[in-house]
C-alpha cells in the first residue's frame, strides 16, 4: 500500500461559501470517502471554516498507510466582501465597457494571494479592473470573471453588458 501522504499528495480542494453562516466548506476532490483526523469530514467535505483562517486536515484511508497526508486549508475571504461593479462612464457607454471588482470590506487574508480573472469573448485579463474600448455600439458583450485565493477559485460572476446606441452621424 502507498502512504496516504503519497496517495493524496496532489489533492485539490474547492471552497463553497454559505452566505447565511458566512462560513466556508472545503470539498476534497478524492474518489473515496476519506477520514479527516480531528476535523470531521462528511462526504469529503470539511465544514464551518472561518474566512482567512488556516485549518489543518489529516487525511487517511484504509487503502493507504501512515504517514497521513497533512493538508493545510487556506480559507479564502468571505465572498460578500467582493462586488463586481460596472464602472463604465455614461458618456462612453456606446463603445466602452469597464468592470471592476470592489473590495467593500477589509479582510485579514493576504491580498498578495488573490488573483482576478476576466474573460470577455476570447479576451482574457488577469486584472482586478478592466476597460474595453473601441467596441461596437449596440452590441451585447458577456464577461465572465472569477477570483482565486492561492489559485483556488472561491467566487465568480458574469455580466452581460449591451453597449449604447452610437451618436447620430458617427
Amino acid at each position: 500500500k502507498p502512504t496516504c501522504d503519497e496517495k493524496y499528495a496532489n489533492i485539490t480542494v474547492d471552497y463553497l461559501y454559505n452566505k447565511e453562516t458566512k462560513l466556508f466548506t472545503a470539498k476534497l476532490n478524492v474518489n473515496e470517502n476519506v477520514n479527516c483526523g480531528n476535523n470531521t469530514c462528511t462526504n469529503n467535505e470539511v465544514h464551518n471554516l472561518t474566512e482567512c483562517k488556516n485549518a489543518s486536515v489529516s487525511i487517511s484511508h484504509n487503502s493507504c498507510t501512515a504517514p497521513d497526508k497533512t493538508l493545510i486549508l487556506d480559507v479564502p475571504p468571505g465572498v460578500e466582501k467582493f462586488q463586481l461593479h460596472d464602472c463604465t462612464q455614461v458618456e462612453k457607454a456606446d463603445t466602452t465597457i469597464c468592470l471592476k471588482w470592489k473590495n467593500i470590506e477589509t479582510f485579514t487574508c493576504d491580498t498578495q494571494n488573490i488573483t482576478y480573472r476576466f474573460q470577455c469573448g476570447n479576451m482574457i485579463f488577469d486584472n482586478k479592473e478592466i476597460k474595453l474600448e473601441n467596441l461596437e455600439p449596440e452590441h451585447e458583450y458577456k464577461c465572465d470573471s472569477e477570483i482565486l485565493y492561492n489559485n483556488h477559485k472561491f467566487t465568480n460572476a458574469s455580466k452581460i453588458i449591451k453597449t449604447d446606441f452610437g451618436s447620430p452621424g458617427e
Epitope: C87, C98, K100, K102, N103, I104, E105, T106, T111, Q112, I114, T115, Y116, D126, N127, K128, E129, I130, K131
Partner: antibody
Framework: EVQLVESGGDLVKPGGSLKLSCAAS????????MSWVRQTPEKRLEWVAY????????YYPDTVKGRFTISRDNAKNTLYLQMSSLKSEDTAMYYC????????????WGAGTTVTVSS | DVLMTQTPLSLPVSLGDQASISCRSS???????????LEWYLQKPGQSPKLLIY???NRFSGVPDRFSGSGSGTDFTLKISRVEAEDLGVYYC??????????FGGGTKLEIK
C-alpha cells in the same frame, strides 16, 4: 520584499513641470489602487492624487486639480505623477502609497522624493 | 472638505506612561455603508508614515497591543497604554470615508518629557 521607490524629485522654478515615478516590486501591482501623498516642510501630510488598479478612475483634491496628473503603467509596475504649473506651495516630500481599494488603508509607503519649487 | 483636527500638537510623556491623542472631524465620517474609515499613522524621525490602526479600532498586523483606537461619529482617540522609546514620532489621523476627498490631521508629536 514589497517595496515602493520614488524618483524624479528636483529643484524647479515656479510655473515649471516635473514628472515623478514610483517603481513597485514584490507584489501584484495591477491589483492595487495607488496614491501620491506629500509632506510639506511644516510636516503636514496632504493626499494629492489617487488612481484605481486598472487606471480607470483618478481623483485629485482641488489644490492640484488641473495641474497634476496621476497615471500608471501596470506592465512596468510603475506609478507616475506629472506636475505642471508648479507653485512654491507644492514644495514637499512626495510619497507613493498603496491602498488595496478605496475602503482599505495605506499599508505600504515609499521612502519619498523631494520636490522644491523656488526661483 | 472634511477637516481633521488633532490635539494636542505636542505630547511630552515619560516612558511607561499612558498617552492619549484626540482627532476630531468637522463632519461625521460614518460612511453610508455603516463603516467609519478612520486610520492612524505613525511617522518616526527620518522615516515614511506607517499604518497603526484602521477602521477606528482595528490594529494592523504587527502593531503591538499597547496601541488602541476608539471613537465614533466625529470624535476619535488613539491610546498608547505604556509608551516605549520606539513609539516616539508624529502621529496622524486620517479619514477615508469621504472618498475621494481623503484628509489627514495636522499631526501630534509624541516626545519624551
Amino acid at each position: 520584499e514589497v517595496q515602493l521607490v520614488e524618483s524624479g524629485g528636483d529643484l524647479v522654478k515656479p510655473g515649471g513641470s516635473l514628472k515623478l515615478s514610483c517603481a513597485a516590486s514584490g507584489f501584484a501591482f495591477s491589483n492595487y489602487d495607488m496614491s501620491w501623498v506629500r509632506q510639506t516642510p511644516e510636516k503636514r501630510l496632504e493626499w494629492v492624487a489617487y488612481i484605481s488598479s486598472g487606471g480607470v478612475s483618478t481623483y485629485y483634491p482641488d489644490t492640484v486639480k488641473g495641474r497634476f496628473t496621476i497615471s500608471r503603467d501596470n506592465a512596468k509596475n510603475t506609478l507616475y505623477l506629472q506636475m505642471s504649473s508648479l507653485k512654491s506651495e507644492d514644495t514637499a516630500m512626495y510619497y507613493c502609497a498603496r491602498r488595496y481599494d478605496v475602503w482599505w488603508y495605506f499599508d505600504v509607503w515609499g521612502a519619498g522624493t523631494t520636490v522644491t519649487v523656488s526661483s | 472638505d472634511v477637516l481633521m483636527t488633532q490635539t494636542p500638537l505636542s505630547l511630552p510623556v515619560s516612558l511607561g506612561d499612558q498617552a492619549s491623542i484626540s482627532c476630531r472631524s468637522s463632519q461625521s465620517i460614518v460612511h453610508s455603508n455603516g463603516n467609519t474609515y478612520l486610520e492612524w499613522y505613525l511617522q518616526k524621525p527620518g522615516q515614511s508614515p506607517k499604518l497603526l490602526i484602521y477602521k477606528v479600532s482595528n490594529r494592523f498586523s504587527g502593531v503591538p497591543d499597547r496601541f488602541s483606537g476608539s471613537g465614533s461619529g466625529t470624535d476619535f482617540t488613539l491610546k498608547i497604554s505604556r509608551v516605549e522609546a520606539e513609539d516616539l514620532g508624529v502621529y496622524y489621523c486620517f479619514q477615508g470615508s469621504h472618498v475621494p476627498m481623503y484628509t489627514f490631521g495636522g499631526g501630534t508629536k509624541l516626545e519624551i518629557k
